[in-house]
Interface confidence: medium
């Protein structure tokens, strides 16, 4: 199986592709803002699962699915009450993933 650092690197590359592409992502669709530090990749996947018909994030969803399946989903501390653009969400996810990649633990 692929190591966690390699999967994180793959996710960083994919998210970097998305964040730098200037085309409006998923036609400006909104998703729930979630606490990534508390819920990790599983809550990110939950939030993005609500987006359909958006080819640009299919690969991200697939990578997140793999990362989430590595362990049981973490309980989110509180229900999300804010919606943000998918592009903004992806930017936050990228920052979180980079931080995890730099500092581990693996």
């Amino acid at each position: 199986s692929v190591s966690l650092p390699l999967t994180l690197k793959e996710l960083i590359e994919e998210l970097s592709n998305i964040t730098q592409d200037q085309t409006p992502l998923c036609n400006g669709s909104m998703v729930w803002s979630v606490d990534l530090a508390a819920g990790g990749f599983c809550v990110a996947l939950d939030s993005l699962t609500n987006i359909s018909n958006c080819n640009a994030i299919y690969r991200t969803q697939r990578i997140l699915h793999g990362l989430c399946n590595r362990k049981a989903p973490t309980t989110v501390s509180s229900l999300p009450d804010t919606k943000i653009e998918v592009a903004h969400f992806i930017t936050k996810l990228l920052s979180y993933t980079k931080q995890l990649f730099r500092h581990g633990p693996f």
Partner: antibody, heavy 123, light 110 residues
């Protein structure tokens, strides 16, 4: 502060090549896409291409496929534009401009520009 | 491609209001905003972002600049016009690639 510094003016003959550089400072280079924009003398702005500074992959406008190569020297925080087989109609000022969806920037807009590099093609 | 149309020249008097228009050949809207931006280019200088997403003023840009519009019709307003506002103004759409600019409107003094 954010700065994009471009290489100096160029005078070339038709058929020659030119390489223009754009050195970025004051921000994380690989977090922001880089665009190139052409402005012919007395004319308006024309978008040429953008390059993903993380992967190095360029996306071209149709009019700038073929003789134009957009590349990176990411370790030096530098984007480059090379034009081969120069023609008279390539005479213009070429600008680099950064853009991206990173928090703190203006989504989808070119928020920092280089000073421009003048390229004159004349026999 | 989305074509953006601007009037080439606008003559104004100092202290008056200048209204610069930009019309798109198709909508530049997405669900949450209108993706039209405005740039100022003084003679011999690089363009400078003034307004992004139709009406958001860039930090450090004077409040006499404002933007409005939706769909296909957009306006940049300068009120009152000052001497250092004499420049060319370009609209640019961020709705789809290829990114396109308007032909520019040159602001001139009456």
């Amino acid at each position: 502060q954010i700065q994009l510094v471009q290489s100096g003016p160029e005078l070339k003959k038709p058929g020659e090549s030119v390489k223009i550089s754009c050195k970025a400072s004051g921000y994380t280079f690989t977090d922001y896409a880089m665009h190139w924009v052409k402005q012919a003398p007395g004319k308006g702005l024309k978008w040429m291409a953008w390059i993903n500074t993380y992967t190095g992959k360029p996306t071209y406008a149709d009019d700038f496929k073929g003789r134009f190569v957009f590349s990176l020297e990411a370790s030096a925080s530098t984007a480059t534009l090379q034009i081969s087989n120069l023609k008279n109609e390539d005479t213009a000022t070429y600008f680099c401009a950064r853009a991206g969806r990173t928090e703190g920037t203006h989504y989808y807009a070119m928020d920092a520009w280089g000073q421009g590099t003048s390229v004159t093609v004349s026999s | 491609d989305i074509v953006l149309t601007q009037s080439p020249v606008l003559a104004v008097s100092l202290g008056q209001r200048a209204t610069i228009s930009c019309r798109a050949s198709q909508s530049v809207s997405i669900s949450s905003s209108d993706l039209m931006h405005w740039y100022q280019q003084r003679p011999g200088h690089q363009p400078k972002l003034l307004i992004y997403r139709t009406s958001n003023l860039v930090s450090g840009i004077p409040a006499r600049f404002s933007g409005s519009g939706s769909g296909t019709d957009f306006t940049l307003t300068i009120d009152p016009v000052q001497a250092d506002d004499i420049a060319a103004y370009y609209c640019q759409q961020g709705r789809e690639s290829p990114w396109t600019f308007g032909g520019g409107t040159k602001l001139e003094l009456k």
